[in-house]
Interface confidence: medium
Amino acid sequence: MQSFNFEDFWENEDFSNYSYSSDLPPSLPDVAPCRPESLEINKYFVVIIYALVFLLSLLGNSLVMLVILHSRVGRSITDVYLLNLAMADLLFALTLPIWAAAKVNGWIFGTFLCKVVSLLKEVNFYSGILLLACISVDRYLAIVHATRTLTQKRYLVKFVCLSIWSLSLLLALPVLLFRRTVYLTYISPVCYEDMGNNTAKWRMVLRILPQTFGFILPLLIMLFCYGFTLRTLFKAHMGQKHRAMRVIFAVVLIFLLCWLPYHLVLLADTLMRTRLINETCQRRNNIDQALDATEILGILHSCLNPLIYAFIGQKFRHGLLKILATHGLISKDSLPKDSRPSFVGSSSGHTSTTL
């Protein structure tokens, strides 16, 4: 494999040093014509997507938080994690109107909001995958090892959640450091990650570390834990426990469907930047277009969990009906007989799950 110097590779710009050519004179055959291309999507369509996700996420995640917070008695460890998950999605959703406005008018909100809003987007992703990894570990301990320690030590769960938020902030730090409002000559200002002339090592660290600790590692933990959890459930023919795991599996599956494509493309992009795979004009443009196509799935994800709970999570529906009945919005007769306030369903006597 050809050797290369990182410093040469990254000398001008933090993204790529591949030369694109546009409007090439026909009489210059020695320079290959190639234009940087991303998906051409109408900006008002983008605004509509942002608006729909914002409304769905705001309504859905607010209801999820309301149901979990309302059901103090039967609240499980998983419920606490799911509460934090809803909180992360809600925080991200609150930034969508700003992104929508910026799509139309350019970034008119200044560098501070540029940093904060970008940070929330990153923190939402990292806290999401880390919380799901913690849920998988909790289910693994509860079902495979029948462990009760975590349930008895509530403060430990709070500590874990606090650690997750801290780690998410740490993984999102590059965005906080390098995002700023860039005022351009011929177009509206943009909120953009400008690394200037930082060293090559920095640039690689800032790309590879978050991808490793914020995606690949939690993904491996989840695969390991759920692999063993499923094996145990099928071995023991635990039908009830298996049903109780449905929502959690659905949450994980939807998360992976939404975020795995984007991160696989991002991984391909990283491999191309480090020249582990050969960079061509076509490949560069394909990756750019794939990033645009897959990132929309990640944005959509923030409003999907509440829909999962509503359609699959029996306990969530019960909890919601109970709140409505408490406030006299529906008749108490319409409440189901078994309306425990936890919304995943129990998975063991000591470690119930909420959805």
């Epitope: 546009s22 011929y186 953009y192």
Partner: nanobody, 126 residues
Framework: EVQLLESGGGLVQPGGSLRLSCAAS????????MGWYRQAPGKQRELVAD???????NYADSVKGRFTISRDNSKNTVYLQMNSLRPEDTAVYYC????????????????????WGQGTLVTVSS
């Protein structure tokens, strides 16, 4: 879409002067290098002069002392002042720029591209 617009070409007598200018427009984050290339009929393209964002200048031996390249970063424009023109300077002059542009629908990403203008004809003849 990034565009390079050249102007200033034309017919001039030997020993005369011309000033070419090239303005870049579009979703430009910054311009690393701007330069001028030329191609005479039936000949290969050759570099005339280029200038980096830091002000480093490079000239072809054939134009040293006669041509002066300069740029206005605030206007994304490069200029080529051509003095003591000779018949052998007759060619189509192309503006070239290595530009960091923004792409992306949801998240803005930077890409470095090598962009070309359509060319302006300079004819030195008596």
């Amino acid at each position: 879409e990034v565009q390079l617009l050249e102007s200033g070409g034309g017919l001039v007598q030997p020993g005369g002067s011309l000033r070419l200018s090239c303005a870049a427009s579009g979703s430009i984050v910054r311009i690393n290098t701007m330069g001028w290339y030329r191609q005479a009929p039936g000949k290969q393209r050759e570099l005339v002069a280029d200038i980096t964002s830091g002000g480093n200048i490079n000239y072809a031996d054939s134009v040293k002392g006669r041509f002066t390249i300069s740029r206005d970063n605030s206007k994304n424009t490069v200029y080529l002042q051509m003095n003591s023109l000779r018949p052998e300077d007759t060619a189509v002059y192309y503006c070239n720029a290595e530009i960091v542009v923004l792409v992306g629908v949801w998240t803005q990403r930077a890409r470095t591209g090598n962009y070309w203008g359509q060319g302006t004809l300079v004819t030195v003849s008596s």
